[in-house]
C-alpha cells in the first residue's frame, strides 16, 4: 500500500503567440481546481475508462479576478497535494490524466458554472520511494507544471511497496545462551508480507500472512502481553514450546479492514487504521465521496452500492463520463430524419428540415400538394419533399402552365410525320408503317 502524490506548481498561459490572457475576467471572477486519474500500466488515456489505480479531486483554489491591462500571471492554485492512495502493489508503469477545471463565480444564466480548461495525459515509469519527478505538459495554449512521486505507507517498502520491514528484536529480548541480537535496525523480510496489523515490535513471520509472536507476547497480532499466570494453564490449547495459551480466532482474523487498512484489536471489537484517502469503520469509503461534489454540469451524486465504488454520477441530458465532465455530441446520433440538418445549441437540439418535412426531428412528411394547383388539367404528384405536376397532353412546365409542343421529342417512328392536335399529337406514318407512333 502507498500513496501517489501530485503537486501542481503552476497553471497559466503557455509561451508563444495566441496564448490566452486568463480564464477569468474582471466581469467573471473564477477559481481553479484539479482532478487526477491514474491507471495501471501503459493503458490508453481515455478519460471515461475507469481510474483503476484511483482518482483525486483538489480543493478549490483562491478566487481570481483578471486586472485589465496587467500581464497574465500564473493563476492562484489550491493548497496542498493531490493524494491518490493505492492498496496493492505500485505497478511501476502508469498512465495519468490531469484535468484543470474552472469554476465561474458569476451567475451564468444558461451555461454551466464549471468548464474543463485543459486535460493533459501521459504514460510514465516511476518507482515507489524515489524522488519527486518534475514535468511540464501543454494542453492547447495552456501550460501545466507539476511534480509527482509514489511513496509507500509503512511498513511497506521497495519500488513496488510489496516488501514489509520491521525492526529487529531489541537486545533485552534475547534469552540466555542464545546468539546476541543484532542492533535495532530496519530488517527487510522481502518478499514476506506478514498479516496486516502484525505488531512490528513483538511479531514476525516466516510465511506470508502469518503473525508469530516473540516470547512474552500473544494475540493474533502479538499485541497482548502474556502474564506468567496465563502460562501452563489447563484452559485451552497450549503451545508445546512455551506452555502459553495459543490464541483462538480474534476480531482481526482475515483482516476486516479494506483498502490497505491495518487492524488492531480493542477490548470490545477491532479498529481499522486507514491509509490516507480512505475512511469508515472498515476503510471502505473512498477519499472522493459525494460530499466532495464530484459530479459536474448539474449531475447528481448517488452513493455507491458497494464499498469499491464510493459514488456514481447521474448525468443530465447532454453530458456523460464518470463525473459528467464530457459533453455528448448529440448530433452524432443523427436524430434528424429525412436528411434534416442537426444543430446542437447546448441547451437544446434543433433540426433544420429539408423542404417538404417538418417536426422537431423532421419526422413529418408534409403534403407537398397542399395548396399547390396544377394548371390546365394537370394532376399533382407528391414525393421527395417537393410537388410535381403530371400535365395533360399539350402542356408542360412545373405547374403545367406552359403550352408544350408534343412533336418536339419526335415521337413518330420510321420517318412518320408529327402533327400537334388539341387532344395531343397525331402521327402520319410513312408507307408500310402503322400504329399511334408508327411503331409497327
Amino acid at each position: 500500500a502507498g500513496v501517489f502524490e501530485l503537486q501542481i506548481h503552476s497553471f497559466g498561459p503557455g509561451p508563444g503567440p495566441g496564448a490566452p490572457r486568463s480564464p477569468c475576467s474582471a466581469r467573471l471572477p473564477c477559481r481553479l481546481f484539479f482532478r487526477v486519474c491514474l491507471k495501471p500500466g501503459l493503458s490508453e488515456e481515455a478519460a471515461e475508462s475507469p481510474c483503476a489505480l484511483g482518482a483525486a479531486l483538489s480543493a478549490r483554489g483562491p478566487v481570481y479576478t483578471e486586472q485589465p491591462g496587467a500581464p497574465a500571471p500564473d493563476l492562484p492554485l489550491p493548497d496542498g497535494l493531490l493524494q491518490v492512495p493505492f492498496r496493492d502493489a505500485w505497478p511501476g508503469t502508469f498512465s495519468f490524466i490531469i484535468e484543470t477545471w474552472r469554476e465561474e463565480l458569476g451567475d451564468q444564466i444558461g451555461g454551466p458554472a464549471w468548464s474543463l480548461l485543459a486535460r493533459v495525459a501521459g504514460r510514465r515509469r516511476l518507482a515507489a520511494g524515489g524522488p519527486w519527478a518534475r514535468d511540464i505538459q501543454r494542453a492547447g495554449a495552456w501550460e501545466l507544471r507539476f511534480s509527482y512521486r509514489a511513496r509507500c505507507e509503512p511498513p511497506a517498502v521497495g519500488t513496488a511497496c510489496t516488501r514489509l520491514c520491521r525492526p529487529r528484536s531489541a537486545p533485552s529480548r534475547c534469552g540466555p545462551g542464545l546468539r546476541p541480537c543484532a542492533p535495532l535496525e530496519d530488517e527487510c523480510e522481502a518478499p514476506l508480507v506478514c498479516r496486516a496489523g502484525c505488531s512490528p515490535e513483538h511479531g514476525f513471520c516466516e510465511q506470508p500472512g502469518e503473525c508469530r509472536c516473540l516470547e512474552g507476547w500473544t494475540g493474533p497480532l502479538c499485541t497482548v502481553p502474556v502474564s506468567t499466570s496465563s502460562c501452563l494453564s489447563p484452559r485451552g490449547p497450549s503451545s508445546a514450546t512455551t506452555g502459553c495459551l495459543v490464541p483462538g480466532p480474534g476480531p482481526c482474523d482475515g483482516n476486516p479492514c479494506a483498502n490497505g487498512g491495518s487492524c488492531s484489536e480493542t477490548p470490545r471489537s477491532f479498529e481499522c487504521t486507514c491509509p490516507r484517502g480512505f475512511y469508515g469503520l472498515r476503510c471502505e469509503v473512498s477519499g472522493v465521496t459525494c460530499a466532495d461534489g464530484p459530479c459536474f454540469n448539474g449531475g447528481l451524486c448517488v452513493g455507491g452500492a458497494d464499498p469499491d465504488s464510493a459514488y456514481i454520477c447521474h448525468c443530465p441530458p447532454g453530458f456523460q463520463g464518470s463525473n459528467c465532465e464530457k459533453r455528448v455530441d448529440r448530433c452524432s446520433l443523427q436524430p434528424c430524419r429525412n436528411g434534416g440538418l442537426c444543430l446542437d445549441l447546448g441547451h437544446a437540439l434543433r433540426c433544420r428540415c429539408r423542404a417538404g418535412f417538418a417536426g422537431p426531428r423532421c419526422e413529418h412528411d408534409l403534403d407537398d400538394c397542399a395548396g399547390r394547383a396544377c394548371a390546365n388539367g394537370g394532376t399533382c404528384v407528391e414525393g421527395g419533399g417537393a410537388h410535381r405536376c403530371s400535365c395533360a397532353l399539350g402542356f408542360g412546365g412545373r405547374d403545367c402552365r406552359e403550352r408544350a409542343d408534343p412533336c418536339a421529342a419526335r415521337p413518330c417512328a420510321h420517318g412518320g410525320r408529327c402533327y400537334a392536335h388539341f387532344s395531343g399529337l397525331v402521327c402520319a406514318c410513312a408507307p408500310g408503317y402503322m400504329g399511334a407512333r408508327c411503331e409497327f
Epitope: R60, E103, L105, G106, D107, Q108, I109, G110, G111, P112, A113, C290, A291, D292, G293, P294, C295, F296, N297, G298, G299, L300, C301, V302, G303, Y311, C313, P316, C324
Partner: nanobody
Framework: QVRLVESGGGSVQAGGSLRLSCETS????????MAWFRQAPGKEREGVAS????????YYADSVKGRFTISQDNAKNTVYLQMDSLKPEDTAMYYC???????????????????????WGQGTQVTVSS
C-alpha cells in the same frame, strides 16, 4: 428517474407563514445539495436557500435572511422551507432543485445559481396578498 416533488404552496396574507416541502428518493437525498429557488412573473429564477443534508451550514439569500428557514427530515428524505413574515414581493413559483456539490460550495451564493442545477421539481405557487 429523478424525482423532486414540492408541496405546501398556497395563498396567504402579508405577515403570514407557509411551509414548503421537497421530497426526493433516498439515493439523491443526503448525497447532494438541495436548494429552493423562486421565480416571479417576468423575473429570473433566483436562489433562496440551500442545505447539504449530510452536514454543513445552510445558505440564505439576503432577501430572505431572518425570515426563511431551511430544514430537513432524514427519515422522510425531505427538505423544508419555513417561510415566516411573508411579504407581497415573496409571491412567486417556488422550485426545489438538487445537484452534486461539495458541502462547502452548497453554502455559497455563487453555487446557488440557476445554471448550476439541471434537476428541478414541478414547482409550487406561493401568493402573498397585502
Amino acid at each position: 428517474q429523478v424525482r423532486l416533488v414540492e408541496s405546501g404552496g398556497g395563498s396567504v396574507q402579508a405577515g403570514g407563514s407557509l411551509r414548503l416541502s421537497c421530497e426526493t428518493s433516498r439515493y439523491i437525498y443526503g448525497n447532494n445539495c438541495m436548494a429552493w429557488f423562486r421565480q416571479a412573473p417576468g423575473k429570473e429564477r433566483e436562489g433562496v436557500a440551500s442545505i447539504y443534508p449530510a452536514g454543513g451550514r445552510p445558505y440564505y439569500a439576503d432577501s430572505v435572511k431572518g425570515r426563511f428557514t431551511i430544514s430537513q427530515d432524514n427519515a422522510k428524505n425531505t427538505v423544508y422551507l419555513q417561510m415566516d413574515s411573508l411579504k407581497p414581493e415573496d409571491t412567486a413559483m417556488y422550485y426545489c432543485a438538487a445537484r452534486s456539490f461539495s458541502i462547502a460550495d452548497c453554502a455559497t451564493q455563487s453555487g446557488i445559481t440557476r445554471s448550476n442545477f439541471a434537476y428541478w421539481g414541478q414547482g409550487t405557487q406561493v401568493t402573498v396578498s397585502s
